[in-house]
Interface confidence: low
Amino acid sequence: KHKCFRKELEENETLESIMNTAESEEELKKYFYYLEGSK
């Protein structure tokens, strides 16, 4: 179960790194803070 959750996080991180533009680092930081908080 833990492995699956980690995989989901990795997929989300990849999606974020692709879809967020260089100009929206704040949005990206906020999202990673949310991820850290959900572990």
Epitope: E11, N12, T14, L15, S17, I18, M19, N20, T21, A22, E23, S24, E27, K30, Y31, Y34, L35, S38
Partner: antibody, heavy 118, light 112 residues
């Protein structure tokens, strides 16, 4: 104004290769993720591939994985799609689109037609 | 993959009358960041797709206010309050919540 112009389409035999390009203007190209989306004649839209603003992250649809590669040259404001081992089902209009923050494809090119036929 | 469905697939409308298109996703489009990445695109005959609505209900710049989007989770709606001749075309919903990004089959809007 913000503009995307695709080129490189044409008629190609099955199994052969083709390289599409997308020239961007009117915005800071190096700040945006870029996508390819295709549309078979008379059909719906199919997302093909994306590349991050810096070129470090790429993702592909399963239907093209291992056959298509996506790249970009930020110094020339150009996006590329290298299509290898082409199949009849790859026949479509190929659009490039800009990926804005907010997870949205906000600007689209006019498209370039790829025909795969023997 | 997330499957997107649309109803109706064809919608003949009278000029000046409202039109409504429904889009449903096979799973929730709410991402872990709390946002729902559902867009609506318009494709006029012979033209490339054009963004109308993003994140369910946000109109893209230059889009007339007769277009509106609503919904949540797995069910979404695009409404045209008063159809004009230039609105003829195919309307697609699209999800960018999860790879691979997927589109609905499209709804053809034409004039009765």
């Amino acid at each position: 104004q913000v503009q995307l112009v695709e080129s490189g389409g044409g008629v190609v035999q099955p199994g052969r290769s083709l390289r599409l390009s997308c020239a961007a203007s009117g915005f800071t190209f190096s700040s945006y993720g870029m996508h390819w989306v295709r549309q078979a004649p008379g059909k719906g839209l199919e997302w093909v591939a994306v590349i991050s603003y810096d070129g470090n992250n790429k993702h592909f649809a399963d239907s093209v994985k291992g056959r298509f590669t996506i790249s970009r040259d930020n110094s020339k404001n150009t996006l590329n799609l290298q299509m290898n081992s082409l199949r009849a089902e790859d026949r479509a209009v190929y659009y490039c689109a800009r990926g804005a923050s907010g997870f949205v494809l906000d600007i689209w090119g006019q498209g370039t037609m790829v025909t795969v036929s023997s | 993959d997330i499957v997107m469905t649309q109803t109706p697939l064809s919608s003949p409308v009278t000029l000046g009358q409202p039109a409504s298109i429904s889009c449903r996703s096979s799973q929730s489009l709410v991402r872990s960041d709390g946002n729902t990445y559902l867009s609506w695109l318009q494709q006029r005959p012979g033209q490339p797709p054009r963004l109308l609505i993003y994140k369910i209900s946000n109109r893209f710049s230059g889009v007339p206010d007769r277009f509106s989007g609503s919904g949540a989770g797995t069910d979404f709606t695009l409404k045209i309050s008063r159809v004009e001749a230039e609105d003829v075309g195919i309307y697609f919903c699209m999800q960018t919540t999860q790879f691979p990004f997927t589109f609905g089959p499209g709804t053809k809007v034409d004039i009765k």
